[in-house]
Structures are given as C-alpha cells and as structure tokens.
Amino acid sequence: AVNGTSQFTCFYNSRANISCVWSQDGALQDTSCQVHAWPDRRRWNQTCELLPVSQASWACNLILGAPDSQKLTTVDIVTLRVLCREGVRWRVMAIQDFKPFENLRLMAPISLQVVHVETHRCNISWEISQASHYFERHLEFEARTLSPGHTWEEAPLLTLKQKQEWICLETLTPDTQYEFQVRVKPLQGEFTTWSPWSQPLAFRTKPAALGKDT
C-alpha cells in the first residue's frame, strides 16, 4: 500500500511470522506506531510495535505463534494497518489487504555444513527453516561462493531449480579459503521474493598432493 511518500511492505515466512517495513518521509522518529493484523477468518488479532531502522523507516515482526506452527493458509486474507499515535488518538497511516501466500519470504537456510571436501571440489548441505509443508517440493535455491580477492556481489549465482538441499562445488583451487551462501524461494506467490542469504559457511579445499599434477 502506497500513499504519497508512504510505503508499507510485508512478507509472510509461510509459518508464523509476518515481517513489515513502513517508510514515510518526514514522519516523527519518536511517534509510537503499531502494525495491526486483522485476519478475515481467524479468531485472533495481532499487533507489533514499529521500531526505527533508519531515518524514515520502521520495522516489526507480527509473531503469530510458535515458529513452526501453520497460522495462515492460501485462502486467508489479513488486513494490515499502520496506526500512529497523534495525541490521544490513533491515526491509520497505511492499510493493505494482505494475501500471505502471495507475499512470501522464507527464513534464510540454516545448518550449513561441509559434507565432504577435496582439492578441487566441496559438497555442502543445508536445511530450510520454518517453511510450510504446503510447498511440498516447490522451492528453488540460489547459491554463491566467495573466492579470494572478490566480493559477494561479484560471485556468480548458481541456481537450483528444485528442492535440493545440497550442492557440489567444483573447479575449486586447492588449499584455498572460500565462503558459501545459499537462499531459498517458493515458486508460489505473485510478490514472493528470495529469503535473506544464509550465514556464510567458511571452508578450505585440501592441498594438492606433493609431486602430483594438479
């Protein structure tokens, strides 16, 4: 929902969290603002207090229940409002009818680990976190490897077009330090976006055997 210079963007993590960011030029930093969630077919309402993240933007997480509980479905619509205190009253600053499964952003993959490392290749696995069982296998991943002397932005993206929670990196340089990250995205949802990148996993390839051709 956009009103002039106001922008209100929320994503559902597919289980029990709706994360929201509200941006407004010229808004007062010390004003108390809340995001209010009103589902169309649930018996609960939920609020979270918006906290400043920059000069003109605020964020909060609507925590709907235990992390792995399935609190919303594909048919739910949640009316989300930003309300800010003006004296003794609360003013609606932004509003949207939010379709959770059209606005997905999963949690970053976790538990990255090196399964097997050699001189030129490394097998890495990971797990997805708090992802709905509704997706079954309809997920895709992107991965990137940080090489010495390069930045993450320069790293080529490797795309896995299926639910595959491992990768075998090849053509690596022996005895070299690398870092690896992965992110995940459901195939469902018009406004669905990539998860944040995972925490980087550092690993080192094995040195080439002495006297052998590499």
């Epitope: 108390s32 809340q34 209010h36 609960w44 309402n45 939920q46 609020t47 979270c48 207090e49 906290l51 909060c60 925590i63 709907l64 229940g65 235990a66 992390p67 309300l83 609360w90």
Partner: nanobody, 123 residues
C-alpha cells in the same frame, strides 16, 4: 494456552516500594502486549500500565504516573511493575494481563489473566 503467574505483592508502609513480577508460559511471550490492572475491594478492575511487545513504549493511568514503572524482559518471559512512593489508595489485588492485540488490552474482555497478587499499603 498462555499462563500468567504474578508474585511480589505484600504489606508495605506508605512511601515504600514493591516490585511485582509476572512470568508468562505456554506461548511465545513476544507476541503479547502486557499490562497491569488492579482491583480494590468493592471496585471495578482498573487499568494501571501497559508495555508494548518490544518494550519500547509504556503507558500509565494518571494516578500512578511518576511512581510506577512497567517493563519487560523478553529473554525471561517476564513483565515487571516497579511501584515506588506507595499510597494507601494503591491497596488492591494486582493482576497481570496479556493480549496479542495492543488495542484490545484495556478492554479487559479478551485478555489472558494471572491469579493476582495482593498489595496492601498501610498508613
């Protein structure tokens, strides 16, 4: 189902202090806006203080402003009410309340409640 257990009440002389605690279990604590209410004999239950899910914003009934401080520790699933400069008219049973909706918590109806802790202020 969320459960709330208060503690810290007691008998204190006017001008004294007490710190009430309320431990929350059975659900994710940071979902909840937390509040303190009190009920004096033969009176309605009244709102005392509220603290938002983040702990950043607090509000108080006029009669306790400057004397009472509400706070929360999200790591300990606990909300506190620090009561200073107590007056005989603060005598009541103090109740901890939880609601996932900040805008509903003062209305009493849909809150989860603790069992209450007695505070008696003698003159």
């Amino acid at each position: 189902e969320v459960q709330l257990v208060e503690s810290g009440g007691g008998l204190v002389q006017a001008g004294g202090s007490l710190r009430l605690s309320c431990v929350v279990s059975g659900d994710v604590f940071v979902r909840y806006t937390m509040a303190w209410f009190r009920q004096a004999p033969r009176k309605e239950r009244e709102f005392v203080a509220v603290v938002t899910d983040s702990g950043r914003t607090t509000e108080y009934v006029d009669s306790v402003k400057g004397r009472f401080t509400v706070s929360r520790d999200n790591a300990k699933n606990t909300v506190y009410l620090q009561m200073n400069n107590l007056k005989p008219e603060d005598t009541a049973v103090y109740y901890c309340a939880a609601n996932t909706d900040y805008f509903q918590i003062r209305s009493v109806d849909n809150n989860a409640w603790g069992q209450g802790t007695q505070v008696t202020v003698s003159s």
